[in-house]
């Protein structure tokens, strides 16, 4: 999906109002310095591409993020403010259904959510030069 035509300011507002709080809740008990940010993004569409990938695509050691509250609200925001987004996700969701049976918070998932927090922070500051 090409995120170029999304309403970035509304997605940012939804993130700041509620999605960010759900990410913090997920990470509660984890030190903010515990994980190094290794995933980066260069502009808002790129950030949303990376956010979608980390949130909804199962990875080795962390197959369960798509069932978390922050993922549900992220999907809602992208569907509402990115034209045509919901129509593009059907195949991806079917492929993930087997991987999402159990919800287990592993260290790998905590690391992945830490990366997500970094991507969202970068999304919110699009004018900053890439480090």
């Amino acid at each position: 999906y090409d995120f170029t035509n999304c309403d970035f300011e509304k997605i940012k507002a939804a993130y700041l109002s509620t999605i960010s709080k759900d990410l913090i809740t997920y990470m509660s008990g984890t030190k903010s310095t515990e994980f190094n940010n290794t995933v980066s993004c260069s502009n808002r569409p790129h950030c949303l591409t990376e956010i979608q990938s980390l949130t909804f695509n199962p990875t080795a050691g962390c197959a369960s993020l798509a069932k978390e509250m922050f993922a549900m609200k992220t999907k809602a925001a992208l569907a509402i403010w990115c034209p045509g987004y919901s129509e593009t996700q059907i195949n991806a969701t079917q492929a993930m259904k087997k991987a999402r049976k159990s919800k287990v918070t592993t260290n790998k998932c905590l690391e992945q959510v830490s990366q997500l927090q970094g991507l969202w922070r970068r999304f919110n500051r699009p004018l900053l030069k890439q480090q």
Partner: antibody, heavy 121, light 108 residues
Framework: QVQLVQSGAEVKKPGSSVKVSCKAS????????MNWVRQAPGQGLEWMGQ????????NYNGKFKGRVTITADKSTSTAYMELSSLRSEDTAVYYC??????????????WGQGTTVTVSS | EIVMTQSPATLSVSPGERATLSCSVS???????LHWYQQKPGQSPRPWIY???TLASGIPARFSGSGSGTEFTLTISSLQSEDFAVYYC?????????FGGGTKVEIK
């Protein structure tokens, strides 16, 4: 304007199933989570589950132990809630409720009128 | 699951008086995830307050919401006849979504 119109009242026998529909209009049906909430007579509200019509993803309240199935038909903008192995305690009003961002806070912003399901032998 | 406990179950108030409804949450949640709904007999619930303190469209200013963590409050500064109803709090912090048992505000 957003409207959620539910199917009519049902009377069912214990052990049978019921399927309640919720027809949505006035918004992009595929892009909003749809929730199902029930209310037994004189009781509070109980969340049963939700579906994202765009891709069919669902989340359920584990209390219902596989008795509830939520589906959606994008072609008719209709969500369905099917409850099986009915017992008398399932007698309730069943509501569909859209999940949406209001002032960028996420909540159930529009509700159907409710469908009364009576389970009686 | 997060348990929502509302008190009192019934609140008897005279018109013009102040009413304070409490919602206690079993584990701390973000204020953005606590909502209130109003329900009158024979009607569907209506969104009333979003995210602890944001009034839904058309809700009069005599209503207010506050709180954080595990304790939240809905206050009606001066009750009018149309305010007599049941009010439910609800969390959208974790699955399963849960509601409080409701507080019925009735005429004294």
């Amino acid at each position: 304007q957003v409207q959620l119109v539910q199917s009519g009242a049902e009377v069912k026998k214990p052990g049978s199933s019921v399927k309640v529909s919720c027809k949505a209009s006035g918004y992009a049906f595929s892009s909003y989570w749809m929730n199902w909430v029930r209310q037994a007579p004189g009781q509070g509200l109980e969340w049963m589950g939700q579906i994202f019509p765009g891709d069919g993803e669902t989340n359920y309240n584990g209390k219902f132990k596989g008795r509830v199935t939520i589906t959606a038909d994008k072609s008719t903008s209709t969500a369905y809630m099917e409850l099986s192995s009915l017992r008398s305690e399932d007698t309730a009003v069943y509501y569909c409720a859209r999940g949406g961002y209001v002032n960028f806070l996420y909540a159930m912003d529009y509700w159907g009128q409710g469908t009364t399901v009576t389970v009686s032998s | 699951e997060i348990v929502m406990t509302q008190s009192p179950a019934t609140l008897s108030v005279s018109p013009g008086e102040r009413a304070t409804l409490s919602c206690s949450v079993s584990s701390s949640i973000s204020s953005s995830n606590l909502h209130w709904y109003q329900q009158k007999p024979g009607q569907s619930p209506r969104p009333w307050i979003y995210g602890t303190s944001t009034l839904a469209s058309g809700i009069p200013a005599r209503f207010s919401g506050s709180g954080s963590g595990t304790e939240f409050t809905l206050t009606i500064s001066s009750l009018q006849s149309e305010d007599f109803a049941v009010y439910y709090c609800q969390q959208w912090s974790s699955y399963p979504l849960t509601f409080g048992g409701g507080t019925k505000v009735e005429i004294k």
